[in-house]
């Protein structure tokens, strides 16, 4: 149509200028489009330079939209993480504060002269919770051994107890059960509770981290071309009012985000495992009950030691021989009053229930995040046509969009008509993140069964997917027992940059 050749480019000028580009590039009227490399080559208001500028802009706009969607999800996960972390740390800090307030009165010098051992125990529990790869059972065993040495010595000031005698006492301890059932009970319950708490919070950290890393994956050149065609070619071809057809937009974004959609299965598995492990937060071995009540197990242990003192001493002498008597030492310590403490079962505060129900709801809401992303971006960011009619932009002209909508994920893009996707070349960053999701899911499943597993990073770029400074300086190299020489390995997923190290205390 000869009349159309001289159609004005006013509308395109307006749109192009509004995007901050120089208007000197824009023709006054349509020109022949043989120079176009992305848009159909009919009459056009776009020069080569304009097409390139708009292609770069559409690419940047999609990446921004993608990052915005990711940021919302990241913010939700970070808020959840902080809330749970604050709560769990609060429980442990409360227990330590209660111990510091009640033990001096309850146990006198048996506590005050051993305060550091108790402080160290809480410090190590905090480290363990925050992701340090230490062996909790070993940590507890070391604490009891250390405490026994000192308490036994305090309870028998009339005896000379050199290091070699204390070594023998230590070897006998397991069979003698000097602290009664408390160490065993604390070990079983604390292991389950701390494993559940830390793996849940780590799960939130890993999920957030995966979202952050995936949001940084660049969109390929084929995607850029397809997005340009989707968003701006209608302007270049003189139909600026035509909005993209919904199915057309979906195919473009399913092609562009094919690798991201492959996260779906493992993402769902992770979130399911996180929801499942919240079951372990309740009951007598639950997180709230145990972490907040560590001090009551410690009190029971000291009471048991005092109650069993005479029997214990007889058995120790039987196993280790008669220690020398300290001629100038006083007689045996008088039996102290039993340390009376609040009952072990903490009434639930209600805080955790509220946190869990909110978390479950929010985790369910984001389960299909990756596969719903193309649809979400199309409906929220792409100003789609309201219906698949013959008035929408189909990539070539105004008209109906006929191709079927592709399935989700890389393999389903083999025949995507809008984006040329090489299904034999999956994105390596995303593959690594899929692996991180798998690792974390396995950890959560082990934690559900009460087991802790070594948490090694499976990514092969050396960067892992730890979320920043969760391991303050080298918190993650675990304390090596004096009794063993096992090495401790750093964790990839220590808690992401949360609580400051307990650090400095002043006498």
């Amino acid at each position: 149509d000869p009349a159309s050749k001289s159609r004005s480019c006013g509308e395109v000028r307006q749109i192009y200028g509004a995007k901050g580009f120089s208007l000197s590039d824009v023709p006054q009227a349509e020109i022949s489009g043989e120079h176009l490399r992305i848009c159909p080559q009919g009459y056009t208001c776009c020069t080569s330079e304009m097409e390139e500028n708009l292609a770069n802009r559409s690419h940047a706009e999609l990446e921004t939209a993608l990052r915005d969607s990711s940021r919302v999800l990241q913010a939700m996960l970070a808020t959840q993480l902080r809330s749970f972390d604050d709560h769990f740390q609060h429980l442990l800090n409360d227990s330590e504060r209660t111990l510091q307030a009640t033990f001096p009165g309850a146990f006198g010098e048996l506590y005050t002269q051993n305060a550091r051992a108790f402080r160290d125990l809480y410090s190590e529990l905090r480290l363990y919770y925050r992701g340090a790869n230490l062996h909790l059972e070993e940590t507890l065993a070391e604490f009891w051994a250390r405490l026994l040495e000192r308490l036994f010595k305090q309870l028998h000031p009339q005896l000379l107890l050199p290091d070699d005698y204390l070594d023998c006492l230590g070897k006998q301890a397991e069979a003698l059960r000097p602290f009664g059932e408390a160490p065993r009970e604390l070990r079983l319950r604390a292991t389950r509770a701390f494993v559940a708490a830390r793996s849940f919070v780590q799960g939130l950290g890993v999920a957030s981290d995966v979202v952050r890393k995936v949001a940084q994956v660049p969109l390929g050149p084929e995607c850029s071309r397809a997005v340009m065609k989707l968003v701006y070619c209608a302007h270049c071809l003189g139909v600026p009012g035509a909005r993209p057809c919904p199915d057309y937009c979906r195919n473009v974004l399913k092609g562009c985000l094919a690798n991201q959609a492959d996260l779906d299965a493992e993402w769902r598995n992770l979130l399911d495992s996180m929801v499942l492990i919240t079951d372990k937060f309740w009951g007598t071995s639950g997180v709230e009950s145990v972490i907040g009540s560590v001090h009551t197990w410690l009190a029971e242990a000291i009471n048991a030691l005092q109650d069993n003192r005479d029997t214990l001493t007889a058995k120790v002498i039987q196993g280790c021989g008669n220690p020398k008597v300290n001629p100038q030492g006083p007689g045996p310590e008088e039996k102290r009053r039993r340390g009376k403490l609040a009952p072990r079962e903490r009434p639930p505060s209600g805080t955790l229930e509220k946190l869990v129900s909110e978390a479950k709801a929010q985790l369910r809401d984001v389960q299909d995040f990756w596969i719903s992303l193309p649809g979400t971006l199309c409906s929220e960011k792409m100003a789609l046509s309201t219906a698949s009619d013959d008035r929408c932009w189909n990539g070539m002209a105004r008209g109906r969009y006929l191709p079927e909508v592709m399935g989700d994920g890389l393999a389903n893009q083999i025949n995507n008509p809008e984006v040329e996707v090489d299904i034999t070349k999956p994105d390596m960053t995303i593959r690594q993140q899929i692996m991180q999701l798998k690792i974390m899911t396995n950890r959560l499943r082990s934690a559900y069964n009460g087991n802790d597993v070594d948490f090694q990073d499976a990514s092969d770029d050396g960067s892992g997917s730890g979320s920043g400074d969760g391991c303050l300086d080298d918190l993650c190299s675990r304390k090596v027992s004096r009794k063993s020489s096992s090495s401790r390995t750093p964790l990839t997923h220590a808690l992401p940059g949360l609580s400051e190290q307990e650090g400095q205390k002043t006498s």
């Epitope: 010098e109 410090s123 190590e124 480290l127 050199p162 190299s477 304390k479 090596v480 190290q501």
Partner: antibody, heavy 119, light 107 residues
């Protein structure tokens, strides 16, 4: 065998800071508390503070709290003691000392580092 | 803080003498007391821990006793190499304070 090797003597001006190192060998570094003790010329021993190399937790003598920082590097089995805002009365030999068995008893000592504060 | 005192501050003795140094704590420290020997220009050396236990490698002429607040270091027969300064230290709780020292010199 257990060895604690300290850094060399330092001469500092009043108001400056000094950082003394203590490299440990012959045992599991993270298994025992490390302490710093100082001794002014002709004076007695003064406990400055301790660090748990496993956790990095520190406890300082109140007298030095505002000026002392103890840190550790587990990769090199080294502890550090930094004292800031030095004054002439900080002239002393500074010792690092390792506990015997979680008991506050110092069975192993470094050779000492003389820090002289003089204008 | 727990304050440690020692007496005497200086002690003149001869080789072969029996020497006793007393250390007192401002509050009960149970059995948590250590004794150190220091010679001029050297780092201190641990002699006794837990109030009465002899550190490995230390001659048996050194002995310690006491509990709570009152402690004693005894050298049963003073040898030439024993002329030095002796410090007590409470190991009950931080800050791990030292006594002011007792100098044992030749009479």
């Amino acid at each position: 065998q257990v060895q604690l090797v300290q850094s060399g003597a330092e001469v500092k001006k009043p108001g400056a800071s000094v950082k003394v190192s203590c490299k440990a060998s012959g045992y599991t570094f993270t298994g025992y508390y490390m302490h710093w003790v100082r001794q002014a010329p002709g004076q007695g021993l003064e406990w400055m503070g301790e660090i748990n190399p496993s956790t990095g937790d520190t406890t300082y003598n109140q007298k030095f709290k505002a000026r002392v920082t103890m840190t550790r590097d587990t990769s090199t089995s080294t502890v550090y003691m930094e004292l800031s805002s030095l004054r002439s009365e900080d002239t002393a030999v500074y010792y690092c000392a390792r506990e015997k068995r979680d008991d506050g008893v110092f069975a192993y000592w470094g050779q000492g580092t003389l820090v002289t504060v003089s204008s | 803080d727990i304050v440690m005192t020692q007496s005497p501050s200086t002690l003149s003795a001869s080789v072969g003498d029996r020497v006793t140094i007393i250390c007192r704590a401002s509050q009960s420290i149970g059995p948590w007391l250590a004794w150190y020997q220091q010679k001029s220009g050297k780092a201190p050396k641990l002699l006794i821990y837990g109030a009465s236990n002899l550190q490995s490698g230390v001659p048996s002429r050194f002995s310690g006793s006491g509990y709570g607040t009152d402690f004693t270091l005894t050298i049963s027969s003073l040898q030439p190499e024993d002329f030095a300064t002796y410090y007590c230290q409470q190991t009950s709780s931080a800050p791990f304070t030292f006594g002011p020292g007792t100098k044992v010199d030749i009479k």
